[in-house]
């Protein structure tokens, strides 16, 4: 009986479409497989950013395979070909593994890069990303946004700069189509005629950094002697009713009461026959249905209700922030 | 619940300055570009510049640069446009105008201050 | 500068029927793949409304029968079917390079 073999696929490579992360791994057919004519051969990827503990593990029968990955660091990459058991009589047949590294040569030290890098999804329609530049460089130092995301032909730069004395501190993206719920990438490069400007990637889903308008049309119904029902409205803009939580924060004659979130524009809140003032604030957030992560919103301007008997209903509207 | 409120009306002689205010709310105002646009009775509309709050940086028309003035008071939440050496030519209704960068248009205007130019 | 052309100046059109307006830049407001062209709708003694950016987005709370189509130099709004209250001035305006422009207007009128 000869041991059954199979060489490693060949021409294994990362390929960088320059899409700031999103990276090609490809790789073609081993050689000698004429024995295996009948056989579907499938191969295991195994990869990696530099640093990290765990593989990524693909099988696959393709020739390719894409995903993203921290341009920070390097990348390597292993791969195998796989002869299932059908083709070997009983048993799988694995090749030797082919590697394969990428990492982009760093230009400058790290210091040069961007600093502080925030991006906030203002209530799912405006994104703003804003930087700190890196420490010691020099005025002359410009850095230059770049962003990528799946639907992109290919990476487009910064329309609107944020300047501060000259210098890009930030930038406002214009409308992204269908850009939500898959990898957002964002490089942010330098140039300076004293010293080389080290880059910096980075890579987020828009759902996941949004910073919704707070709640609007704050108001108050009696609903019986001890019960007020506190309601108010979803802000205008793109975001459906399911996807908020909301935290309101309830004051009573100057004391805080209560503290609650909830999933509804309504609350429902027991009053004694005591109570000369009720105020009432909310904030939004987006939920776990919509999200895997949020930011809160500002608190809805105060609504108060007061007289010498709450159920007077007597409003008053106070068109102050909260704080 | 985004308010662009601006100063009254105004009258004033040739050469004379006015100085017109925008204070906006309802929104975070660093985040927005403030235009300031202008229209002259019976007349279509003409752009004067604009300060990102952000940062204070400003982009003026050249057919103002040497006359305008556009300032921010970020912890007031508003923005001012002076234009100074007054002629009868800028009769006309100013506003203030919000914006989300070049790529949005100018989504939310002011009600527009009257400047009457008359000796 | 970039000047901007409007066409018809005046559109005598009834309820209900379809209107369509044009704009003509002196060069492309296209860039970075986004035509930045505007459309505003402006009624007496009302401050501009925004109708359309980006050339073919609608702006918030602006009913589906505005939309606008163009590139390059070429823009035009279409109202689908006219309401009343559609009857107004509209201005295009280019957000490429500063300054920035507005067209002449288009005022539509009831015939």
């Known amino acids: 009986d000869t041991e059954i073999k199979v060489n490693p696929p060949q021409d294994f490579e990362i390929v960088d479409p320059g899409y700031l992360g999103y990276l090609y791994l490809q790789w073609q057919p081993p050689l000698s497989l004429d024995h295996f004519k009948e056989c579907t051969v499938e191969y295991e990827l195994k990869y990696r950013n530099i640093g990290s503990e765990t593989w990524k593990t693909i099988i696959t029968k393709n020739l390719h395979y894409k995903d993203g990955f921290d341009l920070n660091k390097g990348i390597e990459a292993k791969i195998h070909t796989l002869l299932p058991w059908q083709c070997t009589n009983g048993s799988e047949v694995q090749s030797s593994w082919a590697e394969t590294t990428y990492w982009i040569s760093p230009q400058g030290i790290p210091e040069t890069k961007v600093q502080d890098m925030d991006c906030v999804y203002y209530n799912w329609q405006y994104l703003l990303c804003s930087w700190k530049p890196g420490i010691g460089v020099l005025l002359d130092t410009n850095y230059n946004l770049f962003y990528w995301y799946e639907g992109l032909d290919h990476a487009l730069q910064c329309v609107d700069y944020i300047k501060a004395d000259g210098q890009n501190i930030g930038c406002r993206f214009p409308y992204l189509e269908a850009s939500d719920y898959k990898d957002f990438y964002i490089c942010v490069n330098g140039s300076s005629e004293n010293k080389p400007i080290r880059s910096s990637y980075f890579t987020f889903q828009l759902q996941n950094i949004v910073k919704p308008l707070p709640p609007v049309y704050l108001t108050f119904t009696r609903e019986s002697s001890c019960e007020i029902k506190l309601k108010w409205s979803i802000p205008l803009g793109p975001i459906p009713a399911r996807c908020f939580d909301y935290e309101i924060e309830i004051r009573e004659d100057d004391t805080t009461l209560v503290t609650a979130t909830v999933e509804n524009e309504t609350y429902t809140l027991k009053t004694t026959n005591e109570t000369r003032q009720l105020c009432f604030v909310v904030r939004s957030k987006v939920n776990i249905y919509c999200s895997d992560d949020g930011i809160w919103s500002e608190w809805s301007d105060k609504q108060c209700w007061e007289g010498e008997d709450l159920s007077k209903k007597t409003l008053l509207r106070h068109h102050h922030h909260h704080h | 619940q985004v308010q662009l409120v601006q100063s009254g009306a105004e009258v004033k002689k040739p050469g004379a300055s006015v100085k017109v205010s925008c204070k906006a709310s309802?929104?975070?105002?660093?985040?927005?570009?403030m235009n300031w646009v202008r229209q002259a009775p019976g007349q279509g509309l003409e752009w004067i510049g604009r300060?990102?709050?952000?940062?204070?940086?400003?982009d003026y028309n050249q057919n103002f640069k040497d006359r305008v003035t556009i300032t921010r008071d970020t912890s007031a939440s508003t923005a001012y446009m002076e234009l100074s050496s007054l002629r009868s030519e800028d009769t006309a209704v100013y506003y203030c105008?919000?914006?989300?960068?070049?790529?949005?248009?100018?989504?939310?205007w002011g009600q527009g201050t009257s400047v009457t130019v008359s000796s | 500068e970039i000047v901007l052309t409007q066409s018809p100046a005046t559109l005598s059109l009834s309820p209900g029927e379809r209107a369509t307006l044009s704009c003509r830049a002196s060069?492309?407001?296209?860039?970075?793949?986004?035509?930045?062209m505007n459309w505003y709708q402006q009624k007496p003694g009302q401050a501009p409304r925004l109708l359309i950016y980006?050339?073919?987005r609608q702006g918030s709370g602006i009913p589906d029968r505005f939309s606008g189509s163009g590139s390059g130099t070429d823009f035009t709004l279409t109202i689908s079917r006219l309401e009343p209250e559609d009857f107004a001035v509209y201005f295009c305006?280019?957000?490429?390079?500063?300054?920035?422009?507005f067209g002449g207007g288009t005022k539509l009128e009831i015939k």
């Open positions: 300060i990102d709050p952000y940062d204070g940086d400003i």
């Open positions: 309802g929104y975070t105002f660093s985040n927005y570009l």
């Open positions: 060069e492309s407001v296209d860039n970075y793949g986004i035509s930045f």
């Open positions: 980006a050339a073919s």
């Open positions: 305006q280019q957000s490429k390079e500063v300054p920035w422009t």
């Open positions: 105008a919000r914006g989300y960068g070049t790529a949005y248009g100018v989504d939310y």
